[in-house]
């Protein structure tokens, strides 16, 4: 995935501007891409630093810009380089005078362990000196000067990778300035070969391009790409996927590339020349134009591609026969994709011809990590890629690359992942209210750390010390009850915030624990209320004999219903009444009890009573007499609530006898409320009185009733409403 | 998709020889080395013998050498293993396969030679 | 020739349990001037050819799960399967491509226990 390249704009420095421009295309440096004077290569060069400054027509570029009037300080090596991830990529360059008594063949020459070679430099200016010659700086061999041919030559009959160096030419009396460079670069291998001991076989580098000897890889000419450069890129492309352009009105016309060596400088494709503005002839296409088109079937020679082959035709003569290659393609990749941290799984989908493979398809993370698919497949149009990134941060965001390289060519498209934190609640959820099968949470969502928006909110609820997963509901607002819990159970309660997106779901914040209460006990059985006097009540029940060994007490709650008077009692679990004292007389009180553990018994159903009375009751009213027959009559009455009234007394006897020869009957219960008088004697007159009692004492009747028998043939009155006691 | 079709085992008696084919489709084969590995019944790899690109450096593992030759034509998109003076030894499952960097990446489906009186 | 050497022979792991399998060189198999290690590892299944997992000792082929890791440096390698699945059931080869000619562990049969 490191793609560095160095532009030379014009190593001959005449009076024009100059520029060096090193570019890191398809990857992200960790470090700021450096220009600096390369001494290894030209100790005694100029030691002005350089001024280097952002290439504002690309992301990740830096450009020394130098003006004509810098010519003089130009000379020398330079390098640009680049770091990621531990790893350091260096690319070597020269300048020199266009005046310089001596120029180079080439600027830089890649050649194989044990090659012939012959280092030329030509002769430009014509001096009655001696000419010398340098490498790395340090005096090599020198020509006397009526010796010195239009073509001066370092000739290395094997060479050897210390041979490589810079080499440069002058004569005598001249100096750095105007001298001429040239870069040998030897291979650490013999031709073909690769490895740590140079005896594997590399694949072929069409188009120029060079085995790397420790990897075995083809580093691509400008202009072409793939894994074995047979690929050209389209016009004025340049790159390891072709996405960088150049922006002259001729191209890349005047553009010196420098790559990782082996590979050295040369000019694109469709140039040749030491200043690469030189057009190719006919016939001839590549880097420095040195291939030749040899098309069959008489296609047409493109000095920037090659042989255009007509359709059904490919290869680099267009010898065979097929369908063409289509330079891949990535489709349906967002500019922009947002992604919550955690398991990311993105897809690279890509088409062309032949249909990108597995092992073809890679995606370069900001940092330079280069991963590979974690599942493939493809249809008849598309390949599709899937990546597993396991645990995607924050400081992943970026830009991504999605890079598809095939022997077709090769394609990047870099995309921008931001990733997000995922929301958490800062706090625990509060408990407002427990019963032993609910609870009332206030569930604290705000604030939360993380990124929003809220998409939704779980709240998730489970018993500590159970192997229970945990249960969730889906809230709205921010007060929720909790039903069908389990009784007397410490339960823990936490918040999981979602945001949207797929695995928007965020950490559970923190942890709140409460424990729902007992199921209370069922209440007292045998439950009596009696009024005890004027201000007390007596209420009685049975003994309680609880199940589990908790201590327990009961709870009686009185209120009055006349008043807005309430207490509740306390009382020992082993008694079995209480007296409540403290009352009104002639008041009716509700009473109701409950027997407490740690948790709430249930209430009985309420008791009414009223106090005794302090004053007399009211005379009964409503007094009827009713159903008459010759033996018979029936009576009824009402009485007032409240006045303690226990009995009521029917006083009778036969009008005119004496008061002594009365019948009294005493109704002992209250709640009846009339009475059928029997053993009457026929068509006889009866006065009759009614009386209530309570613990004062009896009504005083206002007036007596009379009460006339029938004869004994006639048939009763009707029989009025009420409790009758026979 | 890159595929490697092997062709030409079978049974063949002790000092005879037999030739094998690697089909490659896929890929530019005339761009690539390609290697030959065999497996003996039940026993690990071994390497056989390579090839460069143009089929200009062949090498071979010491077991082989002087008796295998490895060959190809590129406008066939073809490998040959020409196995001679075929020895019990040999009785192997043979493999074609194509490297990136030095492992080796594409593997036919592998044919079987059995070397038997 | 560089010898390799694979420990142990065979291993029997439970499903879900990690899996390591050790590989030694006869001699170091890391080239100072670029820091990598020229070894490969191969799984193979019966029946099938070999299939490339890691080069590099520790770059993962694609499409190979992610549960497969190599590591080490020099003459010592280690191919680790972090949760073992039951389609891992295979001989595992290690290989190092240092030097010619390339040669290969004796591999490891890996079975569950």
């Known amino acids: 995935a490191m793609d560095l390249i160095l532009i030379n704009s014009l190593p001959l420095v005449s009076d024009a501007e100059t520029s060096l421009t090193c570019i890191a295309s398809g990857w992200r440096p960790h470090e700021p891409i450096t220009i600096g004077r390369d001494f290894e290569a030209l100790m005694n060069q100029h030691q002005d630093p350089l001024e280097v400054t952002q290439d504002v027509t690309r992301e990740w570029a830096k450009k020394v810009v130098w003006k004509r009037e810098k010519a003089s300080k130009i000379n020398g090596a330079y390098f640009c380089e680049g770091r990621v991830r531990g790893e350091a990529i260096r690319i070597r360059t020269m300048k020199m005078r266009q005046q310089a008594s001596f120029l180079p063949a080439t600027l830089t020459m890649t050649v194989d362990k044990g090659d012939n070679v012959n280092i030329s430099f030509k002769k430009v200016l014509i001096k009655e000196e001696d000419a010398v010659i340098y490498k790395n700086g340090s005096f090599i061999h020198s020509v006397p000067r009526h010796e010195v041919p239009d073509i001066l030559e370092v000739h290395l009959p094997h060479a050897q990778p210390q041979d490589a160096g810079v080499y440069s030419a002058r004569y005598i009396g001249g100096n750095l300035f105007t001298s001429a460079f040239t870069r040998l670069i030897v291979r650490r291998c013999e031709a073909q070969k690769w490895g740590p001991e140079c005896n594997h076989l590399c694949t072929a580098c069409m188009n120029n391009g060079v085995c790397h000897e420790d990897t075995g890889e083809c580093i691509c000419p400008p202009g072409f790409m793939g894994r074995t450069c047979e690929k050209a890129c389209e016009l004025h492309t340049f790159g390891r996927t072709c996405k960088e352009r150049c922006s002259g009105q001729e191209g890349c016309k005047s553009y010196v590339f420098c790559l990782p060596d082996p590979y050295g400088c040369s000019c694109a494709t469709g140039w040749k020349g030491l200043q690469c503005n030189e057009a190719c002839h006919p016939g001839f296409y590549g880097p420095d134009c040195k291939l030749r088109c040899s098309c069959n079937n008489g296609e047409m020679c493109d000095r920037f591609q090659g042989c255009l082959c007509s359709p059904g035709w490919q290869g680099l003569q267009c010898e065979r026969e097929g369908i063409p290659r289509m330079t891949p393609k990535i489709v349906d990749l967002p500019d922009h994709i947002e992604v919550n941290s955690g398991k990311f799984n993105p897809i690279c989908k890509a088409s062309g011809w032949p249909l990108p493979t597995n092992e073809e398809m890679t995606l370069v993370k900001p940092d330079g990590t280069v991963l590979h698919p974690k599942d493939f497949n493809h249809t008849d149009h598309f390949s599709v890629a899937i990546f597993t990134i396991h645990r995607i941060l924050p400081p992943d965001s970026g830009v991504w690359v999605c890079s598809v390289n095939t022997v077709a060519g090769m394609v990047e498209k870099p995309f921008n992942i931001s990733v997000k934190v995922l929301p958490k609640p800062l706090n625990a959820p509060n408990v407002i209210d427990t019963g032993h099968n609910f609870a009332v949470i206030n569930i604290s969502s705000e604030p939360y750390f993380g990124d929003g928006p809220i998409k939704s909110k779980k709240l998730l609820y489970k018993p500590v010390n159970h192997y229970e997963a945990w249960q969730h509901i889906q809230v709205t607002n921010e007060i929720v009850t909790l039903n069908y819990l389990e009784p007397r159970t410490e339960y823990e309660l936490c918040v999981q915030l979602v945001r949207r997106g797929e695995g928007g779901e965020g950490h559970p914040g923190p942890v709140r624990r409460f424990t729902t209460a007992s199921i209370g006990l069922p209440p007292p059985r045998g439950l009596n209320l009696l009024p005890k006097s004027q201000t007390t009540l007596n209420l009685t029940w049975q003994p309680i004999f609880p199940s589990s060994e908790d201590d327990f007490y009961v709870e009686v709650e009185r209120r009055s219903v006349q008043k807005s008077d309430q207490q509740n009692i306390k009382v020992p679990g082993n008694l079995t009444s209480v007296l409540l004292n403290n009352l009104h007389p002639r008041e009716q009180y509700v009473v109701r009890a409950r027997v407490n553990t740690k948790a709430q018994g249930e209430w009985s159903e309420d008791l009414t009573a009223w106090t005794l009375s302090d004053i007399l009751p009211p005379q009964p009213e409503n007094i009827k007499i009713s159903n008459i027959t010759h033996s018979s009559a029936v009576i009824s009455w009402t009485i007032l609530d409240g006045y303690s009234i226990s009995s009521i007394t029917i006083r009778y006897k036969v009008q005119g006898k004496n008061e002594d020869q009365h019948v009294d009957v005493k109704i002992k219960n209250a709640t009846i409320t009339q009475y059928q008088l029997k053993g009457l004697e026929p068509e006889t007159a009866y006065q009759v009185d009614i009386f209530a009692e309570n613990n004062i004492g009896s009504s005083n009747p206002a007036f007596s009733h009379e009460l006339v028998t029938l004869p004994e043939s006639q048939a009763p009155a009707d029989l009025g409403g009420g409790k009758m006691l026979l | 998709q890159v595929q490697l079709v092997q062709s030409g085992g079978g049974v063949v008696q002790p000092g005879r020889s037999l030739r094998l084919s690697c089909a490659a489709s896929g890929l530019t084969f005339s761009n690539y080395a390609m290697h030959w590995v065999r497996q003996a019944p039940g026993k690990g790899l071994e390497w056989v013998a390579v090839i460069s690109y143009d089929g200009e450096n062949k090498y071979y593992a010491d077991s082989v050498k002087g008796r295998f030759t490895i060959s190809r034509d590129n406008s066939k998109n073809m490998l040959q293993l020409q196995m001679n003076r075929l020895r019990s030894e040999d009785t192997a499952v043979y493999y074609c396969?194509?490297?990136?960097?030095?492992?080796?990446?594409?593997w036919g489906q592998g044919t079987v030679i059995t070397v038997s009186s | 020739d560089i010898q390799m050497t694979q420990s142990p022979d065979s291993l029997a792991v439970s499903l879900g349990e990690r899996a390591t399998i050790n590989c030694k060189s006869s001699q170091s198999v890391l080239f100072s001037s670029n820091n990598k290690n020229y070894l490969a590892w191969y799984q193979q299944k019966p029946g099938q050819p070999p299939n490339l997992l890691m080069y590099?000792?520790?770059t993962r082929e694609s499409g190979v799960p992610d549960r497969f890791s190599g590591s080490g440096s020099g003459t010592d390698f280690t191919l680790t399967i972090s949760s073992l699945q039951a389609e891992d059931v295979a001989v595992y080869y290690c290989q190092q491509y240092y030097s010619a000619p390339i040669t290969f562990g004796q591999g490891t049969r890996l079975e569950i226990k």
């Open positions: 396969a194509t490297p990136k960097g030095g492992a080796l990446e594409i």
């Open positions: 590099w000792a520790s």
